[in-house]
Structures are given as structure tokens and as C-alpha cells.
């Protein structure tokens, strides 16, 4: 068998579907958590009402070597219109509190579920 081309290009993903997929991934992380998530790594807390997708990525991207959140990091990179690199804090205007990744994921999940229920797919 010959593999022609690369990956098949998936169809366009509506914002509602993209948001639901992120929620499902965060649910998956919280439900499958046994040992401390990412060895208890700490990340900057974010303001969930202020440009949260880029801010969430800027916070989580500084966690390396944690396979449990790699898919989340990848998904969030598609939710942000600008490129985010480790150590970049342009969207994180206030950096005063650090929390464990597990708590960060739970907080983000609760907020995204609320947005989804309210139909805020933007």
C-alpha cells in the first residue's frame, strides 16, 4: 500500500464544535487524573473574562514534558490569533498568583462549560 500525500485535511470546524472538543479534552484530563497533574507544576492564574484563550495558552505553554496537557496546549494554540511562545506574557497582564495545573484546568473547564451553555461560541 502506498500513502499518497500527507494527512487528509479535516473539514472546517465550527466554533461551537471546537469549543466542545476543548471541553471534552479538559473533562478527559480531570477524570483520568491519578497522580498530581504535571507533577504538581504551578502556572499563572488568569482572568477568565479577559481574552482567555491566549492567556490560558501563555500560562500553560510554560509547562513542558507533561503529556497529559499536550493536546490542550495544541488546541489552545488554534484558539489564539497570534503565536505564543514559552516565556511570553503579552496577554497575561496581571501575574500575581500561581496555582497548580490541575486547579487551572478545573477553573478553565468550569468557565468554558458556562460559555457553552450560554451559547457563547466566540
Amino acid at each position: 500500500l502506498t500513502c499518497l500525500g500527507g494527512f487528509a485535511s479535516p473539514g472546517p470546524v465550527p466554533p461551537s464544535t471546537a469549543l466542545r472538543e476543548l471541553i471534552e479534552e479538559l473533562v478527559n484530563i480531570t477524570q483520568n487524573q491519578k497522580a498530581p497533574l504535571c507533577n504538581g507544576s504551578m502556572v499563572w492564574s488568569i482572568n477568565l473574562t479577559a481574552g482567555m484563550y491566549c492567556a490560558a495558552l501563555e500560562s500553560l505553554i510554560n509547562v513542558s514534558g507533561c503529556s497529559a496537557i499536550e493536546k490542550t496546549q495544541r488546541m489552545l494554540s488554534g484558539f489564539c490569533p497570534h503565536k505564543v511562545s514559552a516565556g511570553q506574557f503579552s496577554s497575561l497582564h496581571v501575574r500575581d498568583t500561581k496555582i497548580e495545573v490541575a486547579q487551572f484546568v478545573k477553573d478553565l473547564l468550569l468557565h468554558l462549560k458556562k460559555l457553552f451553555r450560554e451559547g457563547q461560541f466566540n
Epitope: A18, L19, P81, H82, Q88, S91, Q120, N122
Partner: antibody
Framework: EVQLQQSGAELVKPGASVKLSCTAS????????MHWVKQRTEQGLEWIGR????????KYAPKFHDKATLTADTSSNTAYLQFSSLASEDTAVYYC???????????WGQGTLVTVSA | QAVVTQESVLTTSPGETVTLTCRSS?????????ANWVQEKPDHLFTGLIG???NRAPGVPARFSGSLIGDKAALTITGAQTEDEAIYFC?????????FGSGTKVTVL
Amino acid sequence: EVQLQQSGAELVKPGASVKLSCTASGFNIKDYYMHWVKQRTEQGLEWIGRIDPEDGETKYAPKFHDKATLTADTSSNTAYLQFSSLASEDTAVYYCTRYDYYGPFAYWGQGTLVTVSA
Amino acid sequence: QAVVTQESVLTTSPGETVTLTCRSSTGAVTTSNYANWVQEKPDHLFTGLIGGTNNRAPGVPARFSGSLIGDKAALTITGAQTEDEAIYFCALWYINHFIFGSGTKVTVL
């Protein structure tokens, strides 16, 4: 100085494909998302999509998903837009633009006019 | 697919303050729409003015400012100048793609 130099105008037949280039100078494209925008004569702007040149990851506007293909070559610091199955409504000027937090849509290429005509 | 709506034309005078708005058909514009404002001058000269709702791009004069007013994104030109006569496009981010508004032609008489 940051510059985006786009390829020259194209006259193509309906049903054909075209590949436009956008060569950057003054910065590394792998450090930014490169976005592409369409402007038809006397009309507004339409966002086509964006590419992360570092890993080739792309996002497209729904209407361009099956029409446009974005690629990039970091060795030549060039981003590409390929349009397939061209039709008259694809006649437009196409722009590449660099986007980042500190300079959103700050730098634009000069545009490439694509004319689709039999 | 969302529709982004802007005023078609606005007219102002030198020194006056003018506010352009950008509405989303899907509901209130939020900071997660990362509202952008782009200026187009004759001969297809584009300049990004504002991104992320209120983040002014480098080199953009301080008279240009972005904000949220009610359920819309807004661009305010405080003390308009004749060189500000242009078409202004807003672009809103919908999780994984931008949608541009149809543009507002600003005339400074």
C-alpha cells in the same frame, strides 16, 4: 526593516490553480503566524486563513477550506497561498500579513492581483 | 457563520472625536473576540491599528484607541486629523477564524 514582498500579478483560466508567494525580510516567519486576506474590487476584506510556518499548522475560514492551501518554507522565509479550481469570483487582490500580539495585522505585503478569465 | 457589522460612513471635522463600532451577529463582542482594527488608505495601503480589543500597534498615534462599548467593539479617534480620512475595517476572532466587517469610510472635512 520589516517587509513582505509578494509575487507578481497572475492571469489564469477558470478551473486552473495558482500559487502566490510572500517573502519576508527583517524577521523570521517561524516566529509569527502569517495570515492571508482577500480583497475584491470595491469590496471589503475577507480573511482566508493563517499558517504557523514553524510546524505548518493551519486554520482556514470556512468558505476557503476547500479552496485555499497555505504552506511555508522557513529556509527561504516565504509563505505561500495556493488557490485551486479558480472561478471568476476568485478575481481579487490577495495580501499576506504578519500578525502578533504587539503588531496585529501590522505589516502587509503589497498584494497580488489574480485575474480569472477565459 | 457570524456577520460583523460596521457603520458605512462617518463624517467628522478636524479636532473632533469620532467613534466607530463593530457588532457581532452572534451576540456581545467580548475580549475573546480579540477585536482588531485595520486602516486602508488609497492605493491599498493597509495598517493594523489595534489588536486584542485595546492593544495599539507600535507607531500608531495615541489618538487611536480601542475598547468595548456595550455589546460592541469600538475604535475612537480623539482629535481627528485630515490624514485619518480612510476606510477602517474591524475583524473579530471566532475561536478559530477571523471575520472582517464591511468597513467604515471616515471622512474628515
